[in-house]
Amino acid sequence: IWELKKDVYVVELDWYPDAPGEMVVLTCDTPEEDGITWTLDQSSEVLGSGKTLTIQVKEFGDAGQYTCHKGGEVLSHSLLLLHKKEDGIWSTDILKDQKEPKNKTFLRCEAKNYSGRFTCWWLTTISTDLTFSVKSSRGSSDPQGVTCGAATLSAERVRGDNKEYEYSVECQEDSACPAAEESLPIEVMVDAVHKLKYENYTSSFFIRDIIKPDPPKNLQLKPLKNSRQVEVSWEYPDTWSTPHSYFSLTFCVQVQGKSKREKKDRVFTDKTSATVICRKNASISVRAQDRYYSSSWSEWASVPCS
Amino acid sequence: RNLPVATPDPGMFPCLHHSQNLLRAVSNMLQKARQTLEFYPCTSEEIDHEDITKDKTSTVEACLPLELTKNESCLNSRETSFITNGSCLASRKTSFMMALCLSSIYEDLKMYQVEFKTMNAKLLMDPKRQIFLDQNMLAVIDELMQALNFNSETVPQKSSLEEPDFYKTKIKLCILLHAFRIRAVTIDRVMSYLNAS
């Protein structure tokens, strides 16, 4: 058993039917010695008397808010949450596995640049009685500071019969140098509590591996005289790290017909312009990627050919 | 990424082309190592990230773009002195900091070259003959060093009398390749920045 925060305790349990459970001793936070009784949640049934209460915690019915009283007056509370260990693995019932880039990916994180600012998000099908708290650091043995905001509900979507809720959080490394070569990963830890169930999720990454630039901006077409060709030009996104000559991007230019089945023409370039043939009803799209470290491509910026 | 490779302009900062080749070569070698050593801890998540140049060179600091020198988090005051007569330098225009930067890069390359050659000698003794260092990568390191053209004492290749532990050697190869790829990215950024300056 360990303290999550004041008066909230997590009991770690080997979780299988008929498992022996854990013996827990609760102590009433009071100088009083006599006449103390204990109750659980809203029930008035007296579970025991005395300054301490010993309980065998085996299932969720044994968790909840234990209150010690004296003569009708509340003396203190202890909220017991359960953390399930199924066959030696901590349970992951609260969050959905996003399965990208691999199984057991519960937290996903992205950064728009090398400033040390990043966003993480996660999914759940649970809509009520749910709280999250997020901590982060650079490295774990001698952690360096990363400050995270509060997790907020950022999207809701319907998936088949289920509603899915997306939560996200923004974090900023306290003293980040965009040019630094990372040797210690960023660690992100999310505590999730649903009713009386506690779970924790972690993700470990280097900023360089979660980079996803914003799409190129100011995408423009300039028709070339007496030709079906056009000059496409664009700019680096505002959110990208500077100087651009040091933090360079590479680009992919795509000409896509109206039908998804039509052949796509693709050109790769390090410049911020390209000459392509603009077909009728087609659209031109450009996306960006770090030129030297192949992390994710940005989303496409698009403009119609007409 | 299989992209069309642009040939550098003749007037281009001469080391840029070599540094691009270096990054391509080390990335290919790392990919090959990951595939060949699939049952070894060779991914970025599995390995310890060690920098063999730590406390010996200060490439990131010495090569910091001017725009980032205002960022206090970037100013790790590690002072290292270097010899300064490189041929990549645009002669009189070169500041002392630029010379320091390029000579730091040269020292990095020299250190990695020694490590890779020592490691290759061990890998050649492996009866499994599972993986060897790409000669192209070693050649590209050499070409960039020659382009930088710094006079520096030659570091003798380390020789070991004891029987090599091939498992450990292969894990060390992965560690080294990951670190060298990160340094190659920095070198490429620096060359691109200097070329634009």
Epitope: Y16, P17, D87, G88, S91, D93, T124, T125, I126 | P41
Partner: antibody, heavy 112, light 107 residues
Framework: EVKLVESGGGLVQPGGSLRLSCAAS????????MVWVRQAPGKGLEWVAS????????YYADTVKGRFTISRDDSKNTLYLQMNSLKTEDTAVYYC?????WGQGTTVTVSS | DIVMTQSPSSLSASVGDRVTITCKAS??????VAWYQQKPEKAPKSLIY???HRYSGVPSRFSGSGSGTDFTLTISSLQPEDFATYYC?????????FGGGTKVEIK
Amino acid sequence: EVKLVESGGGLVQPGGSLRLSCAASGFTFSDYGMVWVRQAPGKGLEWVASISSGSSNIYYADTVKGRFTISRDDSKNTLYLQMNSLKTEDTAVYYCARNPYWGQGTTVTVSS
Amino acid sequence: DIVMTQSPSSLSASVGDRVTITCKASQNVGTNVAWYQQKPEKAPKSLIYSASHRYSGVPSRFSGSGSGTDFTLTISSLQPEDFATYYCQQYNSYPLTFGGGTKVEIK
């Protein structure tokens, strides 16, 4: 007493469908993840699918992905395995399990 | 997928013998390994989880050890009811995979 009882097995033609059920009792079913495991005649054990408490996370073996669907009804204390597009190689005894408890198994035979 | 290689595939032993079965994972699985016992025409029985933890009710003569890639199930003193097939399983990552089984027969 913890009990898991499978049902729904039988003989089916290739391409056909079957729905297996597993009735659970003696424990708070909704609080536990569950799995289906199968064993072809004379062969070893093969994991088929898993479902977490609350159905938030579901995983399948590649051999059944897209054809089989694991689900649960916590109000009925029942685990299901919907098997479509059955193949002869799906012939096996199917067990539902929640360690350390296993059902007795139900036999599925796919044959023309 | 993680391959669990069990050895031997079969062994002959006498009552009272110490029996050791090994299981090798093709990659690191931590301690996320379980062991099962199965008798002919019966459902498997869970013995060990987390490489070395016995489920309640499992006799103390069964013990598991190992971590990473190498795991062992030991029966300290073989009893008549222990003649069966034993399977290891990794549950570190999906797909969950079983070893091929070890049949323990009477000598």
